[in-house]
Amino acid sequence: LNTTVLQGMAGQSLRVSCTYDALKHWGRRKAWCRQLGEEGPCQRVVSTHGVWLLAFLKKRNGSTVIADDTLAGTVTITLKNLQAGDAGLYQCQSLRGREAEVLQKVLVEVLEDPLDDQDAGDLWVPEESSSFEGAQVEHSTSRNQETSFPPTS
């Protein structure tokens, strides 16, 4: 899988959209996890509603929100009030039983707000309008691994 790079401004919201084959992933919950190290485990941040038919409802964990449009095949994750510590490698996952299939790998980069060191005056950007999807620049590496499920003993 290629890694999608998304950039967001510190203090603003970053929206990530992961698309998938709606029929192939029918009935499956989705999750957003943060990868710990290059080959480390992916630590669950948030997952969609436990009842698949209600997956369109927003689920929140801290400043991260997830919602799934199961008919369109798009799971949307919003990272609110982006902080430098949010930078890193994440995964959109499709859950089935014990298995977690990677839908997309996402590298989140946090840009410092240039206004941080200046007097912002009366400038104020409402939360809703400060959400953007960032530049979806894909790494054209040859690391197109197959999604595999190692046997669990």
Partner: antibody, heavy 122, light 108 residues
């Protein structure tokens, strides 16, 4: 009527290659996973692997990984199980089966082919 | 992999009696991913129960499934002559999917 129709019985010699088929009809073939199951004479069922014909995503049981190849041709709604070099121990009945699903869950293997008998003998 | 152990290996009963078949998993399995199949000689398996307790289309209500975690049960409330067959449990909670070894229900 939803059904899976498998190719006919095969008699082969050790070392020969073989490809058996499973043709789906009466439903959207590309949107359901198709699994393969082996049953050796007088024995139980063994899960070999599964394929999603829509994009040919495939999973194998470790016991069969490298021993067989599962593939599909969605244009003719057909899944395949193949061997490059048969062994006497491959003698068995092979079934294909559809993995069904419903809103928020899984229906098990709800539609089965009639089975293909493979006999490998010198 | 998850190993499913079925017991007893053979169950000898008379028509009209109650049959209780057990399937034990080596690791916990979500009940959503446990199924039961019936196989008669010379025939392909037939799905009876999915999600541990839901009857498949066309399956008579004398067949019922229950259980959770590692212990699952298939019950046939009153055996009919056509029920004498081999029964398999199967999990698709974790790859590789696996079947139990089967329980043969024979006429006493």
């Amino acid at each position: 009527e939803v059904q899976l129709v498998q190719s006919g019985a095969e008699v082969k010699k050790p070392g020969e290659s073989l490809k058996i088929s499973c043709k789906g009809s009466g439903y959207s073939f590309t949107t359901y996973w198709i699994g393969w199951v082996r049953q050796m004479p007088g024995k139980g069922l063994e899960w070999m692997g599964i394929i999603y014909p829509g994009d040919s995503d495939t999973r194998y049981s470790p016991s069969f990984q490298g021993q067989v190849t599962i593939s599909a041709d969605k244009s003719i709604s057909t899944a395949y199980l193949q061997w490059s070099s048969l062994k006497a121990s491959d003698t068995a009945m092979y079934y294909c089966a559809r993995a069904g699903h419903y809103d928020g869950g899984h229906l098990g293997m709800d539609v089965w082919g009639q089975g293909t008998t493979v006999t490998v003998s010198s | 992999e998850i190993v499913l152990t079925q017991s007893p290996g053979t169950l000898s009963l008379s028509p009209g009696e109650r049959a209780t078949l057990s399937c034990r998993a080596s690791q916990s399995v979500s009940s959503d991913y446990l199924a039961w199949y019936q196989q008669k000689p010379g025939q392909a398996p037939r799905l009876l129960i999915y999600g541990a307790s839901s009857r498949a289309t066309g399956i008579p209500d004398r067949f019922s499934g229950s259980g959770s975690g590692t212990d699952f049960t298939l019950t046939i409330s009153r055996l009919e002559p056509e029920d004498f067959a081999v029964y398999y449990c199967q999990q698709d909670y974790s790859y590789p999917w696996t079947f139990g070894g089967g329980t043969k229900v024979e006429i006493k």
